[in-house]
């Protein structure tokens, strides 16, 4: 047989589907590996072949498309399960070939069990919404292509285990769920159950989105340095340990990169000869505002160390801040002037 371009196991596509629900899985070749689509491939005489390896087995076997009620079928570049079973879990391969060309990729499919409250090992997408913002809508995800537009499915929304009926600021509107002036108490898992008919059978699709209410852009600020500050003087004798915390508050900003760093006499700690240890810790508020603390410590401080300029710096997408620590030698009577 001719050589086949084997793209291996595409672990980026860790597909999870619920047991006893329909699942449509597109062959990843056309989405991520090849420059042309299925229609082009098909019209140039290429055939798409599916096979699989069961969980905990090494043997590749063809997929049985002759099951009762066409439980598993293929339509163009889509593999259909109507519905899935737990033992459908495994690695699936789609191969595009003719007599002169071959390309294939495998991907893992996990069929997941859920309980009556939709608890499962499924990984849910996270939707971040701004606190107090007017209206946020979430849409029941990944239901496109399961039924034609002429079919009007019934949709029921749940928060956790509770059907959303008469929630004061959460309104189900078909495939959409609207949040009015969201608060942190709106955090949680929201599940839509879509029920649609097909060939005299009713199918259910269960989709869950994790809602996380975060700080509003209107409250976004440059970093605020709580410590060091002008009120605290770090007064030490040579030989003592010097510990200076740099504590910085960052308001939540979507996709912001928050940075905190120290400079000693204008240089990064790695570029000075002083034996410095820096430990960092991070904590988050209920709206994902961040407090980042970097503790600078010198085990046995020297008189020279006590004359150095220690500056805490912070940066986010809104701006930068810096604050010098007031360090002096005990009994010296004067604080070294800080030049920023």
């Amino acid at each position: 047989s001719e050589r086949c371009d084997d793209w291996g196991l595409d672990t980026m596509r860790q597909i999870q589907v619920f047991e006893d629900e329909p699942a449509r899985i597109k062959c990843p070749l056309f989405e991520h590996f090849l420059k042309y689509n299925y229609s082009t491939a098909h019209s140039s005489g290429l055939t798409l072949i599916w096979y699989w390896t069961r969980q905990d087995r090494d043997l590749e076997e063809p997929i049985n498309f002759r099951l009762p009620e066409n439980r598993i079928s293929k339509e163009k570049d889509v593999l259909w399960f109507r519905p899935t079973l737990l033992n459908d879990t495994g690695n699936y391969t789609c191969m595009l070939r003719n007599t002169t060309y071959c390309s294939k990729v495998a991907f893992p499919l996990e069929v997941v069990q859920k309980d009556s409250c939709f608890n499962s090992a499924m990984r849910f997408p996270v939707h971040k919404m701004y606190i107090e913002h007017g209206i946020h809508k979430i849409t029941c995800p990944n239901v496109d292509g399961y039924f034609p537009s002429s079919v009007k499915p019934s949709v029921t929304w749940y928060k956790g285990c509770t059907e959303i009926v008469d929630f004061h600021n959460v309104l189900p509107e078909g495939m959409n769920l609207s949040f009015f002036i969201p608060l942190v108490s709106n955090n949680g898992n929201y599940t839509c159950v879509v029920t649609y008919p097909e060939n005299g059978r009713l199918f259910h699709l269960t989709r869950t989105v994790t809602v996380k209410v975060v700080g509003s852009p209107k409250d976004a600020l440059p970093p605020q340095i709580y410590s060091p500050n002008d009120r605290v003087v770090y007064e030490k004798e040579p030989g003592e340990e010097l510990v200076i915390p740099c504590k910085v508050y960052f308001s939540f900003i979507m996709d912001s990169h928050n940075e905190v760093w120290w400079t000693i006499d204008g240089k990064k700690p790695d570029d000075v000869t002083v034996d410095i240890t820096i430990n960092e810790s991070v904590s988050y508020s209920s709206t994902e505002d961040e407090t980042r603390t970097q503790i600078l410590s010198i085990k046995k401080v020297t008189p020279e160390d006590l004359r150095r300029n220690y500056v805490c710096h912070a940066r986010n997408t809104k701006g930068e801040a810096e604050q010098a620590a007031k360090v002096k030698q005990k009994g010296n009577g004067c604080t070294e002037p800080m030049t920023l």
Epitope: I131, H133, I135, H168, N169, I181, K218
Partner: antibody, heavy 118, light 107 residues
């Protein structure tokens, strides 16, 4: 100094309408969500309605839903409450209040009295 | 909706004494609870938010505690200007709801 000043209260017959205004000064209204809270004579406080800082999201107490409409004009730094189909039980002092999730109702107006009576 | 219940309805205290006011929520409101003071003919004034943080300009004799469903407002040494009605309010869930109030009067 933050100030909220309500106006538009008065005597109105049952079934009638009234529009309350709340003029804000000392801060930019567009940066804050706002609410109306009322207090019937000799009674406690009751939240009536809220509007988000961008004006898109509104919420109402069940007792006024479908009859009252909250709105805002950020360019005029003013909050409004349109009250229709008024009932005797709507008689109260109406306060506008600034709110943030972090600090609740941090500033209140002095209130305007609405009396619904025939 | 979350029902807020305050006790006692009236508290008679002598000036200089300590006053302890209670507020209970019908379900957890985390720390999203505020306390307000209202004097006759005036608007309410924010005293405490986040269950325990004093609002700007509020004297240190006012302190709040609690989380979840049980909350307390303590006035450590009552001054003449502290005799008023005090309301608790939850802002954890819509609709935001108030307690019925506790009147602190001179004994």
């Amino acid at each position: 100094e933050v100030q909220l000043l309500e106006s538009g209260g008065g005597l109105v017959q049952p079934g009638g309408s009234l529009r309350l205004s709340c003029a804000a000064s000392g801060f930019t209204l567009s940066g804050f969500s706002m609410s109306w809270v009322r207090q019937a004579p000799g009674k406690g406080l009751e939240w009536v309605s809220a509007i988000s800082y961008d004006g898109e999201g509104t919420l109402y107490a069940d007792s006024v839903k479908g009859r009252f409409t909250i709105s805002r004009d950020n360019s005029k730094n003013t909050l409004y409450l349109q009250m229709n189909s008024l009932r005797a039980e709507d008689t109260a002092v109406y306060y506008c209040a600034r709110f943030r999730y972090y600090t609740a109702f941090d500033y209140w107006g002095q209130g305007t009295l609405v009396t619904v009576s025939s | 909706e979350i029902v807020m219940t305050q006790s006692p309805a009236t508290l008679s205290v002598s000036p200089g004494e300590r006053a302890t006011l209670s507020c209970r929520a019908s379900q957890s409101v985390s720390s999203n609870l505020a306390w307000y003071q209202q004097k006759p003919g005036q608007a309410p004034r924010l005293l405490i938010y986040g269950a325990s943080t004093r609002a700007t300009g509020i004297p240190a004799r006012f302190s709040g505690s609690g989380s979840g469903t049980e909350f307390t407002l303590t006035i450590s040494s009552l001054q003449s200007e502290d005799f008023a009605v005090y309301y608790c309010q939850q802002y954890n869930n819509w609709p935001w709801t108030f307690g019925q109030g506790t009147k602190v009067e001179i004994k």
